[in-house]
């Protein structure tokens, strides 16, 4: 690596991301055939102009406006399902539950999950050694700018009731500083948006607490009502029988509590 | 090969109805997007409607949403346009399209005409 | 007024070379595949470029079509007799939810 080079302390950026990124569109431009006419090199190329030869940690929502422009994706607004420590599960939930939709579920978000990139002022290099950390380095790098342009959108595009699934194995279910906490929270639109219903995972097989009067959960309530959007919560006792019985909601067992 | 045939098509008074039928043959029609074009008379082409396959997605012109409806049943092979309130501006020739994968329209029928005229 | 704007007509003579431009916005051409259409008189619009620059088989290789930013065009070379139609270009818009259509080229073979 050349002496001259910014060392960052994040990783760097995803190996083969260009290709990735256009493998990833083209993919999901055949599962989503309402997307066939999305042209994935154009998108590339967006995508590309946001970070590349800026500063990795001068990196506004505006450089992403480009890329936003294809974000106009038709979701169904009443069926977003949000989350927040608890991707897994939310992904596993909407590929059985087909009709509701993630973030990740999207164009946008589909192309970045997982993934980690930068670039380097004035020149047309793409970063692999390292990419600024969020904490360490900065908060406006082209990762984290990114996840709160797209989700900051795909809140304000919600309506009716939006779910939120929230991991109670955390000790604090429901995080300020987390995406949710942070961006979505603040963007759902009140004249749009009746309720939010959060969905709270146990992680324990004998807990059997009720995490719906946990003091985030009670904080949330109070950010979300002060926002004159209801709010409503559940519990989630056993997330396992939970996916299974929205694959299989005819089942005796899954008219008890999950 | 792949044969698009549209009827339905003739002479009707404003704010009358119309039902054109397209009849395809020589590929799997229940697997492809299918389409409705139109051509009025000394102008361009204008794209009026589409519909998915699968669980039937509908896409309209403004021109035309509120008053045309596309439909399809693959049983039968055939794609429909019911036209309600027809205006003067609906006079055109109208043509069936599939659509391929890439979004293009790679197949079309000859087309009818409708003459929207009091 | 078309959404996507073209040239009423361009013309050459036998042999030359015409290209037909297309310009659009970042909601249709931007972000989504140019497709390019041939339209005869009587006859039923012709496929000739899809992807911004495939050609369907059949379609001679004189026919070839580009895309950048958010323009696209389409070039005609060794230009024949037969290539005197009607030409569109089309594309999706976001902004619509459908596809827009070019207002059309005549090109006359002099």
């Known amino acids: 690596v050349p002496r001259w080079r910014q060392q960052w302390s994040g990783p760097g950026t995803t190996k083969r991301f260009p290709e990735t990124v256009l493998a990833r569109c083209v993919k999901y431009t055949e599962i989503h055939p309402e997307m066939r006419h999305v042209d994935c090199q154009s998108v590339w190329d967006a995508f590309k102009g946001a970070f590349i030869s800026k500063h990795p940690c001068n990196i506004t929502e505006e450089d992403y406006q480009p890329l936003m422009k294809l974000g106009t994706q038709t979701v169904p607004c009443n069926k977003i399902l949000l989350w927040s420590r608890i991707k897994d599960l939310a992904h596993q939930f909407t590929q059985v539950q087909r009709d509701m939709f993630t973030l990740e579920d999207t164009l946008l978000g589909y192309l970045a999950d997982d993934l980690t990139w930068c670039g380097e002022f004035n020149t047309s290099k793409i970063n692999y050694q390292s990419c600024p950390d969020w904490r360490k380095d900065c908060s406006n790098n082209p990762v984290s700018v990114f996840w709160k342009t797209v989700s900051r959108r795909f809140a304000e595009a919600a309506c009716d009731v939006v779910h939120v699934m929230l991991n109670g194995s955390r000790s604090k279910i429901f995080d300020k500083n987390s995406t949710f906490g942070s961006v979505e929270v603040h963007n759902l639109q009140p004249e749009k948006v009746q309720t939010l219903e959060a969905w709270v995972i146990h992680g324990g097989r004998e807990d059997s607490r009720d995490l719906c009067q946990d003091p985030t959960i009670k904080e949330l309530e109070s950010i979300i009502s002060k926002r004159n959007i209801q709010f409503s919560c559940k519990n989630i006792y056993r997330p396992d029988k939970f996916l299974q019985c929205v694959k299989n909601p005819e089942d005796s067992s899954c008219t008890s509590e999950i | 090969q792949v044969q698009l045939v549209e009827s339905g098509g003739g002479l009707v008074k404003p704010g009358g109805s119309l039902r054109l039928s397209c009849a395809a043959s020589?590929?799997?029609?229940?697997?492809?997007?299918m389409s409705w074009i139109r051509q009025a008379p000394g102008k361009g082409l204008e794209w009026v409607a589409s519909v998915s396959s699968g669980r039937p997605t509908t896409y309209y012109a403004d021109s035309v949403r509120g008053r045309f409806t596309i439909s399809r049943d693959n049983a039968k092979n055939s794609l429909y346009l019911q036209m309600n309130s027809l205006r003067a501006e609906d006079t055109a020739v109208y043509y069936c399209?599939?659509?391929?994968?890439?979004?293009?329209?790679?197949?079309w029928g000859q087309g009818t005409l409708v003459t929207v005229s009091s | 007024q078309s959404v996507l704007t073209q040239p009423p007509s361009a013309s050459g003579t036998s042999g030359q070379r015409v290209t037909i431009s297309c310009s659009g916005s970042s909601s249709n051409i931007g972000f989504h595949f140019v497709y390019w259409y041939q339209h005869l008189p009587g006859t039923a619009p012709k496929l000739l470029i899809y992807?911004?620059?495939q050609r369907p088989s059949g379609v001679p290789d004189r026919f070839s079509g580009s895309k950048s930013g958010n323009s696209a065009s389409l070039a005609i070379s060794g230009l024949r007799s037969e290539d005197e139609a009607d030409y569109y270009c089309?594309?999706?818009?976001?902004?619509?939810?459908?596809?827009?259509f070019g207002s059309g080229t005549k090109v006359t073979v002099l």
């Open positions: 089309a594309a999706w818009d976001d902004s619509l939810s459908g596809y827009v």
């Open positions: 992807k911004n620059n």
């Open positions: 399209a599939r659509e391929d994968w890439g979004g293009e329209f790679t197949d």
């Open positions: 020589g590929f799997t029609f229940s697997d492809d997007y």
